[in-house]
């Protein structure tokens, strides 16, 4: 769904593009869910514009968003999470554009955290581990993770590994010796829920050991 304004509906026939995008985060604060929307064009004049969600809500017909600078935000327990909601951009009582969205299809997980890399000298490998708050959640529990790593000097040469667990082993022979590496991880819903990649975790930096010339093996760090 494009979310483009039906400009023919506007009395003054303005050509403003009110397209917007949203993402939901479930159980982001205890049992509270959140919904964040923003205009795709950062230069839209948002002075009198409001967002409203109606339908697929518990106990209420509609909810208004809070405006936080350039974003619009709701935190609530009232999302039914079954069926589609109607999200509208409004000026007063007039709707400029609306989108019908199932909030379970626009889920953005929280970023993974506690990323670390441990070198195992005997095994000649690096064990990558990280954590995710979603292990404790009731709804969005199953995630696909994208671990990306690169030699720090290679700005855009990222190697990506997809996995469903929170542990990955990198073989030492696949990495350059005596090099600084950067590694990071993000997550996306992978079961009933659909949506977007999380933000990246904070990066972790590690150095690979040097090669021991006599044996052709790497020296420990």
């Amino acid at each position: 769904e494009s979310g483009y304004a039906q400009n023919g509906d506007l009395e003054d026939a303005e050509l403003d593009d009110y397209s917007f995008s949203c993402y939901s985060q479930l159980e982001v604060n205890g049992s509270q869910h959140s919904l964040t929307c923003a205009f795709e064009d950062p230069d839209v004049n948002i002075t009198n514009l409001e967002f409203e969600i109606c339908g697929a809500l518990v106990e209420v017909k509609c909810l208004n968003f809070r405006k936080l600078q350039e974003i619009y935000f709701i935190e609530t327990k009232k999302f039914l999470l079954i069926g589609k909601s109607n999200i509208c951009v409004k000026v007063g009582e007039k709707s400029l554009t609306c989108k019908k969205i199932d909030l379970t299809t626009i889920v953005k997980p929280e970023a993974p955290f506690d990323l670390s890399v441990v070198y195992r000298e005997g095994a000649n490998d690096f064990v990558v581990t990280f954590n995710t708050s979603h292990l404790q959640k009731k709804y969005v529990k199953v995630l696909m993770h994208d671990v990306a790593y690169r030699q720090e000097k290679d700005e855009n040469k990222w190697t990506h590994v997809n996995l469903s667990s929170t542990k990955l082993t990198l073989l030492q022979r696949k990495l350059q010796p005596a090099a600084m590496y950067e590694i990071k991880v993000r997550s996306i819903p992978d079961h009933y829920f659909k949506g977007f990649w999380s933000e990246w975790s904070p990066s972790y930096y590690f150095r690979t050991p040097e090669i021991n010339n006599s044996s052709g093996e790497m020296d420990p760090i």
Epitope: A38, Q69, E110, E199
Partner: nanobody
Framework: QVQLVESGGGLVQPGGSLRLSCEVS????????MHWYRQASGRQREWVAT???????GYRDSVKGRFTISRDNAKNTVDLQMNGLQLEDTAVYYC???????WGQGTQVTVSS
């Protein structure tokens, strides 16, 4: 063009305090998680703290209870209040918005008696 400008570093005695600030431009700041990293001389860069777009905070173990990260979405700034500074906190501190292709110049924090 993304710009990250850190400030507020300086020389402080152990146990002292500093407040670092980072001004961000060129991104939709309100929608981004923001991070502080640091790099001590001869060491690799390490993560220090994060504040998510929703305001949730996280810290590396060695600074928990001493450092506080905060953000002001109206000013596009992220701050790091550092109390109880220790010798091992000496480093250049950098803020980052999640894309590590972009770094500011950093701000030097030196803890010395």
């Amino acid at each position: 063009q993304v710009q990250l400008v850190e400030s507020g570093g300086g020389l402080v005695q152990p146990g002292g305090s500093l407040r670092l600030s980072c001004e961000v431009s060129g991104i939709r700041f309100s929608l981004r998680n923001m991070h502080w990293y640091r790099q001590a001389s001869g060491r690799q860069r390490e993560w220090v703290a994060t504040i998510t777009a929703g305001g949730v905070t996280g810290y590396r173990d060695s600074v928990k209870g001493r450092f506080t990260i905060s953000r002001d979405n109206a000013k596009n700034t992220v701050d790091l209040q550092m109390n109880g500074l220790q010798l091992e906190d000496t480093a250049v501190y950098y803020c980052n918005h999640g894309d590590t292709a972009y770094w500011g110049q950093g701000t030097q924090v030196t803890v010395s008696s």
